[in-house]
């Protein structure tokens, strides 16, 4: 297996995590897309995901998370508001896309919370929650069930790598069951 | 290895058409965006267009100095672009290279070794 | 459409000294915190080579005296220590938006 790389982000309470994967791919643009938390010996599990088919330019909130999808720079932008300090971990972007396995997006994303306050403009929780208020219609996106683990073995995509997904892939179980995404507190 | 291949080039009178074709291999051709870029003789680069994948409906966008001129199209089956260049005028006259980028709105990664227009009378 | 003025048109430098080239656009060519600003490098009869993508991305096989920096409207692609070899036409290009433009390109020469 290949070893997969991780990008650190060490944030305080109340500050937002801004992350953006990147998709590169046409044909993943109007894919359903993931944001999944990875826990020490557990199945990757999705916390939010877009909408299917993943419309453009369009917010999706599942409590604190954040995701937005920009087809046309091939970027999925994920934001995590209110940091907690139980919000550290190992996150990373998937691409669905069956009935083959989820996508995995480089790199993964290692998440370090910190209690104390940064005093950083916009980092508070008062300018963090005005600045992104966003109309509860977008909440109900419904996300398949995570059932592979094997998107762990993938390399990640160097600049002049064909990055097009094999055709040789595992298909997934229960394609068809969906789980109403969790919802922070 | 990608490797990209262009043909077509030639002497052309002004106000008459060249098509130029861009044999693309090593790739899957379908997933990419492919763009045409040329250079005038002594002169820097100019991007000319490009035409994207089916998953983007083929859309194509160009440069204004060639738009409602030129005509990118793309044929999947064959891996290969074309260049349909009417009404042509002297400033047309370079050498025209495929390029093959890394993904949307990445960078150049790939190019052909070019194929001179030249538009004279 | 979106400007990109290099600086200086032509530049020549000592080997093994550092080479500067600038690139300023008249508009960012920021999406978010990515930069869609990339540098080329083209010597004569050869169509142009990638050096750096997405402002700050050494291109694989490039040597790493090359190097790019700057977001937004100002970018700089840096030669450490100049070679031989690097005598060439150096390029910016902007993809954040259509059309996708080329700056005008800097001669690099050996002094």
């Known amino acids: 297996a290949t070893k997969l790389t991780e990008e650190k982000y060490e944030l305080k309470e109340g500050q937002t995590l801004d992350v953006k994967c990147d998709y590169t791919l046409e044909k993943f643009a109007s894919s359903q897309k993931a944001w999944q938390i990875i826990r020490d010996g557990e199945m990757p599990k999705t916390l939010a995901c877009t909408e299917r088919p993943s419309k453009n330019s369009h917010p999706v909130q599942v409590g604190r998370i954040i995701l937005e999808d920009y087809h046309d720079h091939g970027l999925l932008r994920v934001r995590m508001v209110n940091l907690q300090v139980e919000d550290s971990g190992l996150y990373q972007c998937v691409i669905y896309q069956p009935p083959k396995e989820p996508h995995m997006l480089f790199d993964r994303i290692r998440l370090v919370v910190t209690k104390g306050f940064s005093g950083t403009p916009g980092s508070n929780e008062n300018s963090t929650q005005n600045v992104y208020k966003i109309p509860p219609t977008t909440t109900k996106a419904l996300c398949p069930l995570y059932t592979s683990p094997r998107t762990v073995t993938q390399a990640p995509p160097k600049s002049t790598a064909d990055v097009s997904t094999p055709d040789s892939e595992i298909n997934l179980t229960n394609v068809t069951d969906i789980i109403r995404v969790p919802v922070f507190n | 290895e990608v490797q990209l291949v262009e043909s077509g080039g030639g002497l052309v009178q002004p106000g008459g058409s060249l098509k130029l074709s861009c044999a693309a291999s090593?790739?899957?051709?379908?997933?990419?965006?492919m763009h045409w870029v040329r250079q005038a003789s002594g002169k820097g680069l100019e991007w000319v267009g490009r035409?994207?994948?089916?998953?983007?409906?083929?859309?194509?966008y160009y440069a204004a100095s060639v738009k409602g001129r030129f005509t990118i199209s793309r044929d999947d089956s064959k891996n290969t672009a074309y260049l349909q260049m009417n009404s042509l005028k002297t400033e047309d006259t370079a050498v025209y290279y495929c390029?093959?980028?890394?993904?949307?709105?990445?960078?150049?990664?790939?190019w052909g070794q070019g194929t001179l227009v030249t538009v004279s009378s | 459409d979106i400007v990109l003025t290099q600086s200086p048109d032509s530049l020549a430098v000592s080997l093994g000294e550092r080479a500067t080239i600038n690139c300023r656009a008249s508009?960012?060519?920021?999406?978010?915190?990515?930069?869609?600003l990339h540098w080329y490098q083209q010597k004569p009869g050869q169509p142009p080579k990638l050096l750096i993508y997405?402002?700050?991305n050494l291109e694989s096989g490039v040597p790493d005296r090359f190097s790019g920096s700057g977001s937004g409207t100002d970018f700089t692609l840096t030669i450490s220590s100049l070679q031989a070899e690097d005598v060439a036409v150096y390029y910016c290009?902007?993809?954040?938006?259509?059309?996708?433009?080329f700056g005008q390109g800097t001669k690099l020469e050996i002094k």
């Open positions: 390029t093959r980028d890394m993904g949307i709105r990445r960078q150049f990664a790939y």
């Open positions: 090593g790739f899957t051709f379908s997933t990419y965006a």
């Open positions: 035409i994207r994948t089916k998953s983007s409906n083929y859309a194509t």
């Open positions: 508009e960012s060519v920021d999406t978010f915190d990515y930069s869609f």
């Open positions: 997405r402002a700050s």
């Open positions: 290009q902007q993809s954040n938006e259509d059309p996708y433009t």
